[in-house]
């Protein structure tokens, strides 16, 4: 029995439009058919859930309609995109993976991706 290892990039810079993408990859100890992926944000020792989705292997990842996250899955790899980010959202984003079915349950937590968000400078007024 081995613990599940989760890998994610150490640092990602959000785009000027406030979009950040990163890959969350897990080494599955078993043949899971149902997987839950959660993105946690850790800042100032406070942890909040950013978004979560459960998917069946081979199917697409579906977040809630009002979620700021979207994603796709391919094998043991999940491509996550977080939208609507602002400078105040800079922080450590942790990928949590749970193998929900079939038994046994496995938990895997990544070391986190530090996402840096820089608010764009407002466009200067033109004198035309």
């Amino acid at each position: 029995c081995k613990a599940m290892h989760v890998a994610q990039p150490a640092v990602v810079l959000a785009s000027s439009r406030g979009i950040a993408s990163f890959v969350c990859e897990y080494a599955s100890p078993g043949k899971a058919t149902e997987v839950r992926v959660t993105v946690l944000r850790q800042a100032d020792s406070q942890v909040t859930e950013v978004c979560a989705a459960t998917y069946m292997m081979g199917n697409e990842l579906t977040f809630l309609d009002d979620s700021i996250c979207t994603g796709t899955s391919s094998g043991n790899q999940v491509n996550l995109t977080i939208q609507g980010l602002r400078a105040m959202d800079t922080g450590l984003y942790i990928c949590k993976v749970e193998l929900m079915y079939p038994p046994p349950y496995y938990l895997g937590i990544g070391n986190g991706t530090q996402i840096y968000v820089i608010d764009p400078e407002p466009c200067p007024d033109s004198d035309f």
């Epitope: 029995c1 613990a3 859930e49 349950y105 496995y106 938990l107 937590i109």
Partner: antibody, heavy 118, light 108 residues
Framework: QVQLVESGGGVVQPGRSLRISCAAS????????IHWVRQAPGKGLQWVAV????????YYADSVKGRFTISRDNSKNTLYLQMNSLRAEDTAVYYC???????????WGQGTMVTVSS | EIVLTQSPGTLSLSPGERATLSCRAS???????LAWYQQKPGQAPRLLIY???SRATGIPDRFSGSGSGTDFTLTISRLEPEDFAVYYC?????????FGPGTKVDIK
């Protein structure tokens, strides 16, 4: 504040049934897995069962499999444990506990005592 | 099933002393998912340490966790009167979730 409160414990005869409950408040109940953990008098902690998120996935300790059923009502923020075919060795304080963001059991109820005796 | 063994069964110490509690897992790989709990008589357990070494919210810094592979340690740097209790280790990385038998820290 974040809390779990168990209820429904009592004295029951061997072979009979009992349902205990756990009321949650102060957090988004459906976003967490919730466990039952028991402790026999003077003994250590024993994990009993867990139910995840929307209630579809449940896991049990071998000692209660087939006799106990865990369920949840997310609209009522309540967890249940239906205990059938009770045995003397099921006598214990039953705690409900939340699986926190990082997986450890971060919030515990005060416990409810279940005594199986004739 | 991952079996956890704790030692010693009882630790008799005086306030101000250092307490070192051990937890050994039957299989390696659970290091990221090892927790320590404190339980006082008549009370529910309280989470102290998760992920082998991270302190839970509100836990004083005299409590620290360490270890990897199969061997883990909970250290209380200077025992306060309120620290005399039973301590349990637990693995939560895979089902069934298992607890160690506990170590009782009592006053010498």
């Amino acid at each position: 504040q974040v809390q779990l409160v168990e209820s429904g414990g009592g004295v029951v005869q061997p072979g009979r049934s009992l349902r205990i409950s756990c009321a949650a408040s102060g957090f988004t109940f459906s976003s967490y897995g919730i466990h039952w953990v028991r402790q026999a008098p003077g003994k250590g902690l024993q994990w009993v069962a867990v139910i995840w998120y929307d209630g579809r996935n449940k896991y049990y300790a071998d000692s209660v499999k087939g006799r106990f059923t865990i369920s949840r009502d997310n609209s009522k923020n309540t967890l249940y444990l239906q205990m059938n075919s009770l045995r003397a060795e099921d006598t214990a304080v039953y705690y409900c506990s939340r699986s926190g963001s990082f997986g450890a059991f971060d919030i515990w109820g005060q416990g409810t005592m279940v005594t199986v005796s004739s | 099933e991952i079996v956890l063994t704790q030692s010693p069964g009882t630790l008799s110490l005086s306030p101000g002393e250092r307490a070192t509690l051990s937890c050994r897992a039957s299989q390696s790989g659970s290091s990221s998912y090892l927790a320590w709990y404190q339980q006082k008589p008549g009370q529910a357990p309280r989470l102290l340490i998760y992920g082998a070494s991270s302190r839970a919210t509100g836990i004083p810094d005299r409590f620290s966790g360490s270890g990897s592979g199969t061997d883990f340690t909970l250290t209380i740097s200077r025992l306060e009167p309120e620290d005399f209790a039973v301590y349990y280790c637990q693995q939560y990385g895979t089902s069934p979730f298992t607890f160690g038998p506990g170590t009782k820290v009592d006053i010498k």
